[in-house]
Interface confidence: low
Amino acid sequence: FVRTKIDTTENLLNTEVHSSPAQRWSMQVPPEVSAEAGDAAVLPCTFTHPHRHYDGPLTAIWRAGEPYAGPQVFRCAAARGSELCQTALSLHGRFRLLGNPRRNDLSLRVERLALADDRRYFCRVEFAGDVHDRYESRHGVRLHVTAAPRIVNISVLPSPAHAFRALCTAEGEPPPALAWSGPALGNSLAAVRSPREGHGHLVTAELPALTHDGRYTCTAANSLGRSEASVYLFRFHGASGAST
């Protein structure tokens, strides 16, 4: 089992273990790393391989989404004998190799995290030269990006029969709870839509019928904080217009 999964760091190769078999290809990545949007995160990845003294050209690769086929977000190459892995690709300039691949470490730093970075990442190493071999983590590491709520849209829209409805859309992780307050409302969760597929961090709450003029406030809250935004409804009586 461990030969596939257990995966170790370089310093383990130097521990005195008398029953240790020859090293095999394996990769050690944690199941998940959590960090807040705007911060940086480190995705650890260490590996072992059967080519004990490999000193030839190597390429380190990180991809997102799925193993083997997902888009590359980072790639660097080291020449024979070199410990410097020269970056050939760093998506949006936000990915930087922290580890030393010659020391069996492919750990990656991701800067300026956004909620869109919340996905699974897979590390891969390729040996060229006299040894042709490669290995990629199958399970990868899930980067879990958390974020305080942010209201991305709040609006009043006309409804049938001269009524108005209010929509509030917020993003955050964990997905925020939304509540409306306003004239004759008290505190209402209104109709909260489930996060839409592909937009897992977005939540929308609708007030289907605004019956009174005045200020309507949407509050988004999760364990990391809260955010508020307001709209104003002033109907021109006798007409079907509104000022917001």
Partner: antibody, heavy 114, light 113 residues
């Protein structure tokens, strides 16, 4: 020399819980997964779960998710498996093992009986 | 879960014979990342924990006699013991080392005539 020393046999009542230990020595405890495997008398092997003591990360076989809880104590280099709501189906030998070095404990026999 | 099916369930042999046992997996165990088959063979003698014999379907663990040979790819695998010795009497398990949960076959028991 890499070794795993398991706690002694347990006789427990149905519905009770039991916590088995696996003391590791001879290697860097935090750096290698410890796996737990179940073997009922005269039967085959079943992988229960594994734990990475360095950070406590665990991977479970879904079948055992509500039955077994894995923990590891770095200070004593000991891994534990707690088995809950025991029934006769849980009567078995439980092995801890380090696949990386192909080192196994000798196994702990758990007998569930009233 | 990947289901591992071993056959036969038992084999009766004479010392010096050559024996083969089969292991089939319900899904391919070939890792396209490194072209290795993640199939492991274990030997278990009565009252003992299992012992690793073969990993990556065909790579013999250090210290394992060369009369043990693993072969196969994808979903069909074979363990061959040439020139069986009395100390080889044991149950042999194949195991999916490819994906969670790691699963074992039900075993093939080797008995002596």
């Amino acid at each position: 020399q890499v070794q795993l020393k398991q706690s002694g046999a347990e006789l427990v009542r149905p519905g009770a819980s039991v916590k088995l230990s696996c003391k590791a020595s001879g290697y860097t405890f935090t750096d290698y997964y410890i796996n737990w495997v179940k073997q009922r008398p005269g039967q085959g092997l079943e992988w229960i779960a594994r734990i990475y003591p360095g950070n406590g990360n665990t991977d479970y076989n879904e079948k055992f998710k509500d039955k077994a809880t894995l923990t590891a104590e770095k200070s004593s280099t000991t891994a534990y498996i707690q088995l809950s709501s025991l029934t006769s189906e849980d009567s078995a030998v439980y092995f801890c093992c380090l696949w990386y070095f192909d080192v196994w404990g000798t196994g702990t026999t758990v007998t569930v009986s009233s | 879960d990947i289901v591992m099916t071993q056959s036969p369930s038992s084999l009766t042999v004479t010392a010096g014979e050559k024996v083969t046992m089969s292991c089939k997996s319900s899904q391919s165990l070939l890792n396209s990342g490194n072209q290795k088959n993640y199939l492991t063979w274990y030997q278990q003698k009565p009252g003992q924990p299992p012992k690793l014999l073969i990993y990556w379907a065909s790579t013999r663990e250090s210290g394992v006699p060369d009369r043990f040979t693993g072969s196969g790819s994808g979903t069909d695998f074979t363990l061959t013991i040439s020139n069986v010795q009395p100390e080889d009497l044991a149950v042999y398990y194949c195991q999916n080392d490819y994906s969670f949960p790691f699963t074992f076959g039900s075993g093939t028991e080797l008995e002596m005539k």
